[in-house]
């Protein structure tokens, strides 16, 4: 039975050109994490394998950095990065757990409307 739960950073609103950290945390299970995949829509961004370490997809190498931890850092954000991001935890013996984060990247003119917020 899958007892674990995924906690995420929560949805994030960021400004064009900035950088953000996407993180997920698997709790309430003793299952062993064998691999974590980070995906955007249908694209694989990165893999963190327990034995082999990190692999960043070639098309994202310039703007995606591994970590901290099992998280992912996205740099030089563009409006095109707006969308849904998935952390997919492959575990043994539980199976797969998935977390979802919505990242919204705003032009500075739009972001200024929320100036009282911490905009990464």
């Amino acid at each position: 039975m899958m007892t674990g739960t995924i906690e995420t950073t929560g949805n994030i609103s960021a400004e064009k050109g900035g950088s953000i950290i996407l993180q997920c945390h698997l709790s309430s299970t003793t299952a062993q994490v064998t691999q974590v995949n980070w995906e955007q829509q249908d694209q694989l961004l990165a893999i963190c394998n327990a034995d082999l370490g990190w692999h960043i997809s070639p098309s994202f190498k310039d703007r995606v950095a591994p970590g901290p931890g099992l998280g992912l850092t996205l740099q030089s954000l563009t409006v095109n990065d707006t969308g849904e991001y998935f952390c997919i935890y492959h575990t043994y013996p539980d199976g797969t757990y998935t977390g979802r984060i919505f990242l919204e990247v705003l032009e500075s003119s739009v972001a200024e409307h929320g100036a009282r917020f911490q905009i990464p």
Partner: antibody
Framework: EVQLQQSGPELVKPGASMKISCKAS????????MNWVKQSHGKNLEWIGL????????SYNQKFKGKATLTVDKSSSTAYMELLSLTSEDSAVYYC???????????WGQGTLVTVSA | DVVVTQTPLSLPVSFGDQVSISCRSS???????????LSWYLHKPGQSPQLLIY???NRFSGVPDRFSGSGSGTDFTLKISTIKPEDLGLYYC?????????FGAGTKLELK
Amino acid sequence: EVQLQQSGPELVKPGASMKISCKASGFSFTGYTMNWVKQSHGKNLEWIGLINPYNGATSYNQKFKGKATLTVDKSSSTAYMELLSLTSEDSAVYYCARGTLITGFAYWGQGTLVTVSA
Amino acid sequence: DVVVTQTPLSLPVSFGDQVSISCRSSQSLANSYGNTYLSWYLHKPGQSPQLLIYGISNRFSGVPDRFSGSGSGTDFTLKISTIKPEDLGLYYCLQGTHLPLTFGAGTKLELK
């Protein structure tokens, strides 16, 4: 002036599909996500999903995955929501709403009443 | 999904009253950057919902200062200091921090 103009009321048969439009004006269409909200029984509000007009990226409430499909036409600044395989449970008022996470849903369309009946 | 519990569901008022509506979430609405995406709406019959408050406590443009929002973490409040006829309707809170976005069940502000 920001405006979201939705298509008119629809009476559709069970099993059919239909598409609601939401024409945006008075702002940069690609600069804001477009959300869709369902209001049933005159009270409950449910978030269906959103679409980023800039790149077409979507995020759905899992409850509406397979029921609603969100698209945009950038050339006409129009967002669309297609509702599939309609049943009486889908009878409701549907709203489009312009929003950001920061400001919430600042502007709403006037709503489209969908009635599913044989 | 994050459950948003709104209380009370019904609130009978007289004009001039001060009222509070509560919104509680099943998990914290602060994201990892300390931002909390919590907004309040008024929905009047025959109209579209209108944004009152965003980011817990920021009044949207044109919203009278008798409306105020407060709270943090999982506990949020909308206060209306002096009820006027145009304030009657359904009030909703919405959390935008976690997917899917979720609304409270609504509070009906009606005359006693």
